[in-house]
């Protein structure tokens, strides 16, 4: 089945996420809380009145307002996650599909540049998709994924940031920098 | 009172296509899962497919690509359309309704679906 | 997938004699096992569900038990209506697969 009602939830690499049923409160009615990794359609965690909490593994946590925790994000956690509320009678009363797409964290880009023919260079190393942003005194220059090498004559001394950003993490790095008149490095 | 009626049952050569209906009254139906489960004559009981409330499916290896569960809520109905039949699909269809954890709380009378040339 | 085994395939007792059915799973299923009856041209019929659970309108003298691996399905005194085909389905884990069925016939 297509899945077109699915929370789109990011998570970071070797980082926690809570998946949170939205709408959702805890009752005496409940008698049931599921939840399901679709791919291989297991059972991993589940909350069962007066019972013992089942998890399929340790990475997995259920709370008691049907959160589930997953510890230590892995590649293979990405996957379309279910959680299935059912009353006492058996009565589907709450569904809800996730998502969950994992990157890695991106790391703070390196800007690095030569006096000699003005040029600078942003460099973002680790990440997933990153989105490099370079400034200059504020103004918005260039946007790239990995690597922005820019040209610059307007001044020989200029402040510069560059942003590297991914769904699940943002970084910067601000260098001032001057190159004398001649362009030495 | 639950009642689960099924329909559609019948004939088919190998390779064709059927779609059954099953009618629910009694009950919220669009609140509950439901699955099909099918019996090849004098064998045991072999699960087909489900649907949940909201609308997701899972199927077996054994029929995966070839039918599909559907549910239309506004009729109170549940469907099965199976395409490429083979002759071992030649079973007794019956419809369920579910509770938490797969247990098939009301059944349907049946409905024959035979696949031979 | 989960196979569940079913022993005997087939029960000769009389009414009255009391009934022991047994289901093995291959691997742990806590207690996410349900017991149904199935008599000669019609839909089975739910008896017990989560091992032990009786359900609403299925006589006192059906009773389930076990946990993880070994479960039982008992008949205290079997009466005519009882003779029929008895299965065993998983509720743990997809596919919800169903052992192949214990019949009780009449000695």
């Known amino acids: 089945k297509e899945i077109t009602n699915a929370l789109e939830t990011w998570g970071a690499l070797g980082q926690d996420i809570n998946l949170d049923i939205p709408s959702f409160q805890m009752s005496d009615d409940i008698d049931d809380i599921k939840w399901e990794k679709t791919s291989d359609k297991k059972k991993i965690a589940q909350f069962r009145k007066e019972k013992e909490t089942f998890k399929e593994k340790d990475t997995y946590k259920l709370f008691k307002n049907g959160t589930l925790k997953i510890k230590h994000l892995k590649t293979d956690d990405q996957d379309i996650y279910k959680v299935s509320i059912y009353d006492t009678k058996g009565k589907n009363v709450l569904e809800k599909i996730f998502d969950l797409k994992i990157q890695e964290r991106v790391s703070k880009p390196k800007i690095s540049w030569t006096c000699i023919n003005t040029t600078l260079t942003c460099e973002v190393m680790n990440g997933t998709d990153p989105e490099l942003n370079l400034y200059q005194d504020g103004k918005h220059l260039k946007l790239s994924q990995r690597v922005i090498t820019h040209k610059w004559t307007t001044s020989l001394s200029a402040k510069f940031k560059c942003t590297a950003g991914n769904k699940v993490s943002k970084e910067s790095s601000v260098e001032p920098v001057s190159c004398p008149e001649k362009g030495l490095d | 009172e639950v009642q689960l009626v099924e329909s559609g049952g019948g004939l088919v050569q190998p390779g064709g296509s059927l779609r059954l209906s099953c009618a629910a009254s009694g009950f919220a139906f669009s609140s509950y899962d439901m699955s099909w489960v099918r019996q090849a004559p004098g064998k045991g009981l072999e699960w087909v497919s489900y649907i949940s409330g909201g609308g997701f499916t899972y199927y077996p290896d054994t029929v995966k690509g070839r039918f599909t569960i559907s549910r239309d809520n506004s009729k109170n109905t549940l469907y099965l359309q199976m395409n490429s039949l083979r002759a071992e699909d030649t079973a007794v269809y019956y419809c369920?309704?579910?509770?938490?954890?797969?247990?098939?709380?009301?059944w349907g009378q049946g409905t024959l679906v035979t696949v031979s040339s | 997938e989960i196979v569940l085994t079913q022993s005997p395939a087939t029960l000769s007792l009389s009414p009255g004699e009391r009934a022991t059915l047994s289901c093995r799973a291959s691997?742990?299923?806590?207690?996410?096992l349900h017991w149904y009856q199935q008599k000669p041209g019609q839909a089975p019929r739910l008896l017990i569900k989560y091992a032990s659970q009786s359900i609403s309108g299925i006589p006192a003298r059906f009773s389930g038990s076990g946990s993880g691996t070994d479960f039982t399905l008992t008949i205290s005194s079997l009466e005519p209506e009882d003779f029929a085909v008895y299965y065993c389905q998983n509720g743990h884990n997809f596919p919800p697969t169903f052992g192949g069925g214990t019949k009780v016939e009449i000695k």
């Open positions: 369920a309704r579910q509770g938490a954890n797969w247990e098939l709380v009301y």
């Open positions: 691997q742990s299923i806590s207690d996410f």
